[in-house]
């Protein structure tokens, strides 16, 4: 019989008036020894499922069921997975800003639309929250005596093509 609760291990509780280390009852836990009570284990139900079961020394850990994701510290609530056109942030699912898109369901981040003009191409189809811009073929303006340098793929050498 111990005289003090200070030496009690995690997974036990101890009352000062009766300083005996007692094991936590089923469905309770204590991660620190010597506490007067054990804590009730978290139950993962509904939109939650167990990620880690409760032990006498550790609380249960929950995760969200398929199609949902966790929000808040220690997964305090479940929110429906983000749909295409959204991205997951700390605050939940956020719709992609205009000029960005996400074509994935439940995952991914909003990415900027392709800038067709950087490749000298026109916009064939405008972008949406769910789809990238579709670029057209390169814009080539033919004028008399235009010289086009044609470089075959994979080769450094070029062929010169005279357009008259």
């Amino acid at each position: 019989v111990q005289n003090s609760c200070d030496n009690c291990q995690p997974g036990t509780f101890c009352r000062k008036y009766n300083p005996v280390c007692k094991s936590c009852p089923p469905s309770t836990f204590s991660s620190i020894g010597g506490q007067p009570n054990c804590n009730i284990c978290r139950v993962c139900a509904g939109y939650f499922r167990f990620k880690k079961f409760c032990s006498s020394t550790h609380n249960a850990e929950c995760e969200c069921i398929e199609g949902f994701h966790c929000l808040g510290p220690q997964c305090t609530r479940c929110e429906k997975d983000c749909r295409p056109g959204q991205e997951l942030t700390k605050q939940g699912c956020k719709t992609c800003s205009l000029g960005t898109f996400n074509d994935q369901n439940g995952t991914g981040v909003c990415r900027p639309w392709t800038n067709c003009s950087l490749d000298g191409r026109s916009v064939l189809k405008t972008g949406t929250t769910e789809k990238d811009v579709v670029c057209g073929p390169p814009v080539v303006s033919f004028s008399p005596s235009t010289t086009i340098s044609v470089t075959p793929e994979g080769g450094p050498g070029g062929h010169s093509l005279q357009v008259l």
């Epitope: 605050q91 719709t95 205009l98 949406t128």
Partner: antibody
Framework: DVQLVESGGGLVQPGRSLKLSCAAS????????MAWVRQAPTKGLEWVAS????????YYRDSVKGRFTVSRENAKSSLYLQMDSLRSEDTATYYC?????????????WGQGVMVTVSS | DIQMTQSPASLSASLEEIVTITCQAS??????LAWYHQKPGKSPQLLIY???SLADGVPSRFSGSSSGSQYSLKISRLQVEDIGIYYC?????????FGGGTKLELK
């Protein structure tokens, strides 16, 4: 309560500049995309520009591109629209609007609007 | 650009009557459609978002639906406060585009 209050409108000559401001309150401004929408007298609504929460992605309608600049100051919960090289066709009531966070891009709250008249 | 063709441009209806306004999208916009009501001299107010979801504080007599690329706003029993102009908005592709508006008056 969400509140959006526009200011800075008035009468301006063609080719001149004007800067509109929108003071936001009642929500965490830095989380939301914001937009400017205009309405010419007796006409319909026309989206003008949008800006991402951090201000790094502005987007404009073609007719104002290169002339208008949308910006924001999250620390002041303020949205701006710098309008340069103004034209008579820019005459309209300009509304500041908040885009919903996780919806379908709908503009869920609007200011009362500010009138901009471009005339010589 | 995605065109939103709204019809009718104007309509006159009696109190308690059922009113339907439609918007036709020129291309697929999924559920990225909202409806607004604008009273004279006021700013637009959100009624419906995501094609069919009712915005906070909006009476249940308003409802939204779609069939293919046609979107509808229905007012089941018209009230005096419902007069004004109604607009649809597609916020799927850039630029965001509004329908031309439907002016609703009391008969």
């Amino acid at each position: 309560d969400v509140q959006l209050v526009e200011s800075g409108g008035g009468l301006v000559q063609p080719g001149r500049s004007l800067k509109l401001s929108c003071a936001a309150s009642g929500f965490i401004f830095s989380y939301f995309d914001m937009a400017w929408v205009r309405q010419a007298p007796t006409k319909g609504l026309e989206w003008v520009a949008s800006i991402s929460p951090s201000g790094d992605i502005p987007y404009y309608r073609d007719s104002v591109k290169g002339r208008f600049t949308v910006s924001r100051e999250n620390a002041k919960s303020s949205l701006y629209l710098q309008m340069d090289s103004l034209r008579s066709e820019d005459t309209a009531t300009y509304y500041c609007a908040r885009r919903s966070y996780g919806g379908y891009s709908e503009l869920d709250y609007w200011g009362q609007g500010v009138m901009v008249t471009v005339s010589s | 650009d995605i065109q939103m063709t709204q019809s009718p441009a104007s309509l006159s209806a009696s109190l308690e009557e059922i009113v339907t306004i439609t918007c036709q999208a020129s291309q697929d916009i999924g559920n990225w459609l909202a409806w607004y009501h604008q009273k004279p001299g006021k700013s637009p107010q959100l009624l419906i978002y995501g094609t069919s979801s009712l915005a906070d504080g909006v009476p249940s007599r308003f409802s939204g639906s779609s069939s293919g690329s046609q979107y509808s706003l229905k007012i089941s029993r018209l009230q005096v406060e419902d007069i004004g102009i109604y607009y649809c908005l597609q916020a799927y592709g850039a630029p965001w585009t509004f329908g031309g508006g439907t002016k609703l008056e009391l008969k």
